[in-house]
Structure formats: C-alpha cells, structure tokens
C-alpha cells in the first residue's frame, strides 16, 4: 500500500495495452460496479445500520487483552538496548515484523530512511571538569552510569549525552539558571542584570522541555550548557534510589535531544522524506540544531560544580532544589576557588544513519480507505523499561488481539494501521518521515491516531491528553472499564479517574488535557490535522513533584523497574492497554465517528475567553490600536450553533443510507483538518494547527490559540508597539478566519 | 558477601617497582569507587589513593603524586596500584577499600566501608 514508488508487473503490462482495450474493460468494469454497489445496498445487514459497535466484537477484543502478555512482551523487549540506528534496533524491528505476521495483520512492512542522528565519540569521551588557575584538571565528571546489577556486561549502552549538541571545548565561569526557562531568564536578565554572555550555563532539569532549554541559553548569548537532575525534581521523598525503590542515584543521568525541530522532522530533509533521492541540506543549513555544546550530568557531579558557586545569591526559594550547595547564581566560584573554571570536553558526532518504522495493516471490510492509527516509537536511549517498551509491548498485546479477532472471521469497518516509530527520541524523526511520505493520503483518508508510547509515568491515575472530538469517547469507554486502582474494585474506570484527577471546569467528570509535543502524535496532529489523543497511567501530581519519574532516559530503566516497583501485577498496563485498543477499536468500528463536534465548540469558547483575559491586561493599548476580539466571539457563536444542528442531523439521519453515512462522517473526520492553515504559525511552518500548538517556550505543553498568544508574548518589551499589536490584530483574524471556516464545514451540505 | 582481596606485595629495593592486585567480589565492583590506604608499622592508617567508579577522577596523596599510578579493570573487578620509585617510607601494609557512596565519582571525601585483609610492602636494602 505505501511503496508507491515501486511499479508492479500489472501495471507496467497495463501500460502496453492498447487504448481501446483499456477503455473497453473500463466501461465493462464499471457496470459490474454499478450492478454490485446496488446489490450491496439492498442487502445491507441491519447491523451495519446502527452507531453501537456490537457489544460482543468490543467484548470479545477487550477480553483478549492479558496482563501476563504485556509482561512477557516487555521483558522481551528490555533485555538489550536498542538505541535508534543500531543493529538491535533493526534486528527487533524485524522481530516486531514477523511477530505481527504471525498474529495475523493482513500486511506488515518495513521502512527505511535516512536521518541524521547524534552519537558520543566511543573513543574521545564527553565530559566536564573543574580546572585550575594552570589548567589542570582537579576534577571530571563520571563517562558513564554505574550499571545496574545484572546488567554489567552489557555492550552497547551508550554514555548519557544531549543528542545533536555540536562539538566544543568552551571555558568560563559557571551561572545557575535554574530550569533555562523563559523566566528564569528573566529574572537574572532583567531583575538581577546578570549577563550570560560567554558563559557556561548549569541548569536543573524539569518543567519545561530540555532543547528550549538550550535555546534560551543560546538567545542568552551562552558558550555552553550543563543539564543536571536536582533530587527536588527526581527524587522523591521517603524512597529508595534504584536498585531498592524507583528513585534516581546520584550517579543517574537523563539523556535526550536538544533539538527546536520545531516539527520539521530529519533537519536535513525538512517537509519531505528522508529517502534514497531526498536532497539534504548541508548541516549548517540544518534545521533546529543547537549551536553551543550542551552535556547532562547526574546530582553527585553537580553538587561539585555548584558547591563552589559565587556571586549574586539565589533570588528566592523557586530557585533552590535539594542539594546540600548554596544555589548562588554566579558568575564563577567563590572566594579562594575563584580563578578556577568550568570546562566542557564534547566531542559528539551527528552523521546520516539508516532507520526503520514497522508498519502493520489490517484491512477495513466496509471503508478500506479510512485510516485508524495505533502507532508508538520503539527505539529507546538504553533499555527502554518504560520508555517506549511500556508502550510498544502494549501496542503488541493490543495487535495479537485483533489478529485474534481477524483469524475468527471478523474485521473492522475501517482499515487500522500500526505503527512501530524508529527515532523517537531523535526527534520524532521515524513517525514524521513516514507521514511527509504519505502525507496525501494520510490527509484525504486519516480519521484519528492513537500514540502509545510509555504506558505508565506511575500507577496512581488515568492521564489523557487529546483532540475536544475524542472527549466523549474517551468518557463513554472509561465508563465501561473496570478501574484497576486499590479502593475501587467493581467500580468503572471513569469513577476512580474523576475522583483522582477531577476536570478543574466541571464537577463530575475528570481531566482530559490539550495535546502538547515531545511524542509522535505531533506530525499527524499539528501538522496534518488528524484527531489525535494519547493515554497513559500517571503519578499524583499533587503530592509527587518531581518532574516526568525519576529514572527517565537513565540506564536503570530497566524491566525490573516496571516489575517489582511500579506495576507487579501488569494491571496498569492492561487497563492501559484496554483505553487505547478501546479508542482504535471503537474509531476503527463505529458506524458513524464516535466524535463529538459540540465539546470543540466549548472549548473554543473557553480558548477565546481565555485569550482575550491574557489581551485585556493591557487595556490601553488595544483601545489606541483598536484591538477587538468581537469577531473571534462571533465566530465561535457561529461554530457553536452550526454544530449543535450537525449534531441532531447526525442522531437523526438514515444511517442505512450509505451515500449519506459516508457524507456525515466524511464532515466529522475533516473537522479537525479544518483547524489546519495551509501557511503555518509565524515561524513554525510545520506546526499548522490554529487552535493547538507546542507551547513556544515547552515544546511538551499544548497552547491554545497560539498564534494569538505569541504575538501578545512579553508584548511590553516590543520595542515597535505599534507593529506589534497589528501581529495580534493579524492573528485574530486568522483564527477568527480558521473557526468561521471550520464551523462551515458542518453545514449542511446543500 | 562482600570481598576484597589484595595481593602483589613483597620487598623490593629502594627505586624499585610493585604492582598490587585486588581482587573484588560480592558486590557491583563497576558502581563503586575504590580506593588504596596504607599502615606503616607503628603508624596509624593513611589514605593514599582512590579512583572513581568509572575512572574519570583519580586522586593520590602529596606523598606519592608522580610514583604511584591507581588504575581498575571493571570487567575483571580488579583494582590496582602501580609502584615506583619505592622509598623505604613507602613500607607499610596496604588494603584496598570500597567506597560506601555508591554512584560517586567526586573526590575521596567520605568514609570506606569494606576492607581487604592487606598485602604487605617492604622497601628494604
């Protein structure tokens, strides 16, 4: 189905022919066409004419799902690395191939491209050091991660480095900038006048993504950066560091890229596919790289770096973690150990490297030209325990129980599609190569992706992050899931979620957050308009602080992690396991789209109020400039009426006419393309979505009507005024523009 | 359980070289920094080496800076120390011991909290 490079022997044979022989088997085709098409619709099952899936296909889907299968599956997939690139991750590739075969997809293919990758010099070890006054190293932080038992006389696990950091020996004193956030530049900016300038940076890891991290440190005009994990943020009170609890060791390092792709995908090959015949661009022309060289470190090597810390103190608490060192901001050392500096040794290397998505295809019986998507990545940093094989040995179960299904004689009405996503944490590379690949027709026939990455972040509640569409799917499915959490047995899935992460808007019902990035939703969501949604079981953020879970991207992320300390019993997997193969089932089967158009119209009116709060903090200025939001109101009124009419046409429209069926669900699937703007957000080309965007400044977070809120951004410090609040008049009407637009695709059609 | 084995000791001329062994067992030898203390007789203990767990920190008393060079194998959890240039005030029994910071790789500022039971060196003429 995707090759669509590679000619078959039919059609070159076709290409011989002669024309009339052609046309004539053209007009003979089309008439059996006709005649089947008529006699199809007489004989229509009555089933085929209802919205409710038959409760025993859903039943029967659900029961086959085994907490025992998850298990065995990620044991499976965590007894080696497998770092995007390799030969391991090739080989497990191939293992997922045949092993999909073998469940019985209709087709399961690989495929390959090109990518640039980031890799540490196996000879030439990154590192940091403290250096005296004649250069000589007094101190070095650590080459690699002590490994874990069991686990020592594994090769190939790669030292903790930032993916893509370019190459430098940089020099200087040390400034602390807390999490490198936009504030916290800020604040020593423009409160303590502290300059970056040539300075090596140390900031904790947490809040905001690691690459606008960098990105800021770099604006801050920065010669390196230091991440570092505080335990304030990655260890949690009153538990033991691995190997006896789920907690970092001091010697635990984070790795990951630091990239602002910005959703570009390979930064050679911006927009298109990193194929045999791609142009690539030369790497200074590269997309999203970081310019300064960039090195994370665990809490033991930072208490050395910041122990000696001098000059201006900490301005408040927020800027203190956990370690026993002052947290003064500096620049440099104190006192006696003020001629020494920091110096950086990195000598990583990008290069082009081969890597492999596994696509897995289960044929639609009624609507084989509608896309459902089950995709997650499956490359990890080290041994992946939970990220991504949490996920991908979900995806698995997920996948031998619809083969299940299908060798039993059943299919879904729509084809399902699974993903195995290369290079995740290169950047989302695997998934957004693939879809530059079939972008026409992912956006003539995608109705929703589902993304499975990590299936627990803890084991305390349901998270789930997606598109307003998938709400009521969500709420409606969970109901009819049976919670796995202690204190609720016999009680629904959506009861024990509502009462541990209650909706801060309405009483009674739990929260769904926007979709951000950082995962590999991101292309088919924020660029292609596909309805989106993920979920995930997730700590308790009101009592557990620390930023994602402790070991995350460390070597000790290992299968023991997820068996003795998280989820003995796999429940939170399967529970997991059952939301997503859930949602793809219910997608995938449904007569018409389980999607509901008012929950957008609601959040848009709450987007708009919110954004036009954020304008009206500066009431001075949209009365001199004549700034309105009356259009952007009109408009959502506008969506919100024309969608409660689809709404009653949907309950009461003739669901056995075909013709109509296809006509009201093709209007639900192309709402959320609607939201698309073919030309971008300023300066971000590939996020196109109007409503939703990565945060600019956490490229984790989603951000509401983004356009907008950029351009009102520190809109004070705009040393053109003027020109400034015409960018935010100019944004209001493209989202005024986009919502009005949406709202017309709802109308009825003639 | 937790052991440490030193060996490699003996007498040896002044200027004379020594490599001492120590075999470690019982315990993730690749998490640990190590470290080298010597008696002398009728002295007290001195510290006079330690390398970290992944041998990016090495660190020597003034005594010995330029003659002895600490090194490990952690795919044979093996610690050693190189001697050179012996001096009869290098005469002691020498014990290798861990490090009871797992996952450090800082200075040797912390107490140790396995010992080895000694290999005795003799710079005699």
């Known amino acids: 189905m995707w090759n669509l490079l590679h000619e078959t022997d039919s059609a070159v044979a076709t290409a011989r022919r002669p024309r009339w022989l052609c046309a004539g088997a053209l007009v003979l085709a089309g008439g059996f066409f006709l005649l089947g098409f008529l006699f199809g619709w007489f004989i229509k099952s009555s089933s085929e004419a209802t919205n409710i899936t038959p409760k025993h296909n859903m039943k029967a889907f659900l029961d086959e799902l085994k907490a025992e299968n998850i298990k065995k599956f990620l044991h499976n997939f965590t007894q080696i690395p497998h770092l995007a690139g390799t030969e391991q991750n090739f080989q497990l590739a191939k293992q997922i191939q045949s092993q999909w075969k073998e469940f019985g997809l209709d087709s399961v293919e690989l495929t390959h491209y090109d990518v640039l990758l980031s890799y540490p010099n196996k000879t030439h070890p990154n590192y940091i050091s403290i250096i005296n006054e004649d250069g000589n190293e007094i101190f070095n932080t650590s080459l690699f991660e002590p490994p874990p038992a069991g686990y020592e006389n594994v090769s190939d696990i790669v030292p903790p480095f930032s993916a893509f950091s370019p190459q430098g020996m940089p020099e200087g004193d040390l400034v602390y900038v807390n999490y490198a956030r936009t504030e916290d530049f800020f604040k020593l900016e423009r409160d303590m006048k502290i300059n970056c300038s040539g300075k090596i940076v140390i900031a904790r890891y947490g809040k905001v993504f690691r690459g606008n991290k960098v990105k800021n440190a770099q604006l801050a005009g920065a010669t390196g950066v230091i991440l570092y994990s505080d335990p304030a943020d990655y260890f949690a009170p009153g538990v033991k560091s691995y190997p006896d609890g789920w907690n970092l060791p001091g010697g635990g390092v984070q790795r990951g890229n630091i990239l602002n792709l910005n959703g570009a995908g390979d930064p050679l090959t911006p927009g298109y596919p990193a194929n045999e015949y791609a142009y690539r661009r030369g790497i200074a022309e590269a997309v999203g790289l970081p310019s300064i060289p960039v090195h994370p470190i665990g809490y033991y090597d930072a208490q050395k770096l910041l122990e000696k810390m001098g000059g201006s103190a900490s301005p408040d608490s927020s800027w203190r973690g956990s370690l026993k060192v002052p947290y003064n901001v500096g620049p440099g050392f104190t006192g006696n150990f003020s001629t020494q500096k920091v110096k950086m040794h990195i000598h990583s290397t990008s290069e082009v490297t081969r890597i492999y998505n596994v696509i897995g295809t289960l044929r639609g019986a009624v609507e084989p030209d509608r896309y459902v998507i089950l995709g997650g990545h499956r490359d990890s940093w080290v041994f992946g325990g939970i990220d991504p094989q949490s996920g991908a040995a979900v995806v698995h179960e997920i996948v031998r129980s619809f083969g299940t299904l299908k060798k039993e004689g059943w299919r879904p009405r729509r084809t399902i599609l699974f993903a195995s996503w290369d290079a995740e944490e290169f950047g989302l590379l695997g998934s957004t190569e693939w879809a530059e690949e079939n972008s026409r027709l992912l956006q003539e026939r995608g109705v929703a992706y589902i993304n499975a990455d990590s299936s627990i972040e803890g084991n305390y509640t349901l998270r789930v992050d997606c598109t307003p569409l998938m709400y009521s799917l969500v709420y409606n499915l969970t109901k009819e899931l049976e919670s796995p959490d202690e204190g609720f047995e016999g009680k629904s899935l959506y009861e024990s979620w509502t009462k541990k992460s209650p909706s801060p808007e309405f009483s009674g019902m739990p929260r769904i957050s926007k979709l951000g990035s950082g995962n590999d939703f991101e292309v088919f969501f924020q660029r292609l308009g596909i309805a989106s949604g993920r979920a995930r079981y997730t700590k308790n953020w009101e009592t557990n602080k620390f930023s994602s879970y402790p070991l995350y991207h460390s070597v000790y992320e290992t299968y023991e992690l997820v068996e003795k300390f998280y989820d003995p019993m796999f429940k939170y997997h399967l529970t997991v396991a059952q939301v997503r193969g859930g949602m793809v089932f219910e997608l995938a089967n449904s007569v018409v789209l389980p999607f509901d158009c008012r929950d957008y119209a609601v959040v848009l009116r709450k987007y708009a109020d919110k954004i036009y709060n954020i304008s009206m903090k500066h009431p001075q200025e949209m009365k001199t400039y004549s700034v309105s939001f009356d259009s952007l109101f009109s408009a959502v009124k506008n969506f919100t009426e024309i969608a409660s009419k689809f709404s009653e046409r949907l309950r009461d429209f003739d669901k056995s006419n075909p013709i109509l069926l296809r006509m009201m669900n093709d209007q639900l699937m192309f709402l959320e393309r609607a939201f698309i703007d073919p030309l971008g957000l300023p300066d971000r080309p590939f996020y196109r979505h109007v409503i939703y965007a990565p945060s600019s400044h956490n490229k984790y977070a989603g951000e509401s009507f983004p356009g907008i809120y950029d351009a009102l951004f520190d809109i004070e410090s705009k040393v053109d005024p003027s020109q400034a609040w015409g960018e935010v008049k100019r944004q209001i009407s493209i989202a005024t523009f986009t919502v009005q637009a949406a709202a017309e695709t709802l109308s009825e059609v003639a | 359980q937790v052991q440490l084995v030193e060996s490699g000791g003996g007498l040896v001329q002044p200027g004379g070289s020594l490599r001492l062994s120590c075999a470690a067992s019982g315990f993730t030898f690749s998490s640990y920094g190590m470290h080298w203390v010597r008696q002398a007789p009728g002295k007290g203990l001195e510290w006079v080496a330690f390398?970290?767990?992944?041998?990016?920190?090495?660190y020597y008393v003034d005594s010995v800076k330029g003659r002895f060079t600490i090194s490990r194998d952690n795919s044979k959890n093996t610690l050693y120390l190189q001697m050179n240039s012996l001096r009869a005030e290098d005469t002691a029994v020498y014990y290798c011991?861990?490090?009871?910071?797992?996952?450090?790789?800082?200075?040797?500022?912390?107490?140790?909290?396995?010992w080895g039971q000694g290999t005795t060196v003799t710079v005699s003429s």
């Open positions: 390398m970290s767990y992944d041998g990016s920190n090495k």
């Open positions: 011991a861990k490090g009871d910071y797992d996952f450090w790789s800082g200075y040797p500022d912390y107490d140790m909290d396995v």
